[in-house]
């Protein structure tokens, strides 16, 4: 069966939107008005993995681009990257673990925990126009809470 996907945008808990500022650069900044069109539309695929009521394994692809968020160990540190894939083979139900995030819903907010690196989360900085990254702390200065907005296909 084909993998189930939905299109959505994400904003962090400070209402910063995610935009592409270059081919491999995902940054978070406040947008308003017409500029909202710049925000990235994700194709969120529901993939194989450990699942519970509040934890759902997903892959985050960029709609109509052959790019996925992935988590790799780079120089001993878990690192978030945008990775090119062969569009003929993705998305798929059994995604490699580096592409899988546990979507965790808490108090109407979402966290995205790396399946490859437990307790490492998709994060944004308090500062404007900084890269989205993989952070190893929750509840600190960096932001790990997001809201999701559905986008019609």
């Amino acid at each position: 069966a084909p993998v189930r996907s939905l299109n959505c945008t994400l904003r962090d808990s400070q209402q910063k939107s995610l935009v592409m500022s270059g081919p491999y650069e995902l940054k978070a900044l406040h947008l308003q008005g017409q500029d909202m069109e710049q925000q990235v539309v994700f194709s969120m695929s529901f993939v194989q993995g450990e699942e519970s009521n509040d934890k759902i394994p997903v892959a985050l692809g960029l709609k109509e681009k052959n790019l996925y968020l992935s988590c790799v160990l780079k120089d001993d540190k878990p690192t978030l990257q945008l990775e090119s894939v062969d569009p003929k083979n993705y998305p798929k139900k059994k995604m490699e673990k580096r592409f899988v995030f546990n979507k965790i819903e808490i108090n109407n907010k979402l966290e995205f925990e790396s399946a490859q690196f437990p307790n490492w989360y998709i994060s944004t900085s308090q500062a404007e126009n900084m890269p989205v990254f993989l952070g190893g702390t929750k509840g600190g200065q960096d932001i790990t809470d997001f809201t999701m907005q559905f986008v019609s296909s």
């Epitope: 081919p23 990257q81 945008l82």
Partner: antibody
Framework: EVQLLESGGGLVQPGGSLRLSCAAS????????MSWVRQAPGKGLEWVSG????????GYADSVKGRFTISRDNSKNTLYLQMNSLRAEDTAVYYC?????????WGQGTLVTVSS | QTVVTQEPSFSVSPGGTVTLTCGLS?????????PGWYQQTPGQAPRTLIY???NRSSGVPDRFSGSILGNKAALTITGAQADDESDYYC????????????FGGGTKLTVL
């Protein structure tokens, strides 16, 4: 203050190899894609190569594909360009730059001269 | 192989407005090419003016603006000044197929 400092250039014979380094400071290196751009004497700019944050995706200009390899060490805040099978036409000042599409600031560059 | 095209030279009067363009030998430039504009004066390292179509780099005066005009990327300089006399390069990302970027040949801008 964001700073990029290129090193490793010099005189090399055709067919030889060089490894360029770029030491980055003043920003969180591991969260940025990086690139190399070169400029031959009296010529325009040429994008050479780019690498994403984790090193999983790279890109190369057609003129260097198969001869040059870009890499990075996020623990050392350093970008590299391994250049093999060098040709006279690779003679240029090599700049490293933040982001795939080279955003400010640029370093001062390192000169590579390929000559017998 | 796709070529990035720029006007070889352009002149503008002090205080005037000039628009430099950046096109593709085949096809149209879009925001998915992440157009960038770079200024270089002789003997100096390049300076990024505009990235991602229309984002000004820090410290760049708002006299410089980027846009898409028709099927090309454009750099507009309003209120041209003597020290704007430089070489201007654009660069375009060439899609995830080739996964590279290409600079145009540059435009030599004269302010007279």
């Amino acid at each position: 203050e964001v700073q990029l400092l290129e090193s490793g250039g010099g005189l090399v014979q055709p067919g030889g190899s060089l490894r360029l380094s770029c030491a980055a400071s003043g920003f969180t290196f591991s969260t940025y894609a990086m690139s190399w751009v070169r400029q031959a004497p009296g010529k325009g700019l040429e994008w050479v190569s780019g690498i994403n944050t984790g090193g999983g995706s790279t890109g190369y200009a057609d003129s260097v594909k198969g001869r040059f390899t870009i890499s990075r060490d996020n623990s050392k805040n350093t970008l590299y360009l391994q250049m093999n099978s060098l040709r006279a036409e690779d003679t240029a000042v090599y700049y490293c730059a933040k982001d795939w599409m080279a955003t400010t600031p640029w370093g001062q560059g390192t000169l590579v001269t390929v000559s017998s | 192989q796709t070529v990035v095209t720029q006007e070889p030279s352009f002149s503008v009067s002090p205080g005037g407005t000039v628009t430099l363009t950046c096109g593709l030998s085949s096809g149209s430039v879009t925001t998915n090419n992440y157009p960038g504009w770079y200024q270089q004066t002789p003997g100096q390292a390049p300076r990024t003016l505009i990235y991602n179509t229309n984002n000004r780099s820090s410290g760049v005066p708002d006299r410089f603006s980027g846009s898409i005009l028709g099927n090309k990327a454009a750099l507009t300089i309003t209120g041209a000044q003597a020290d704007d006399e430089s070489d201007y390069y654009c660069a375009l990302y060439m899609s995830s197929g080739s996964n590279n970027a290409v600079f145009g040949g540059g435009t030599k801008l004269t302010v007279l």
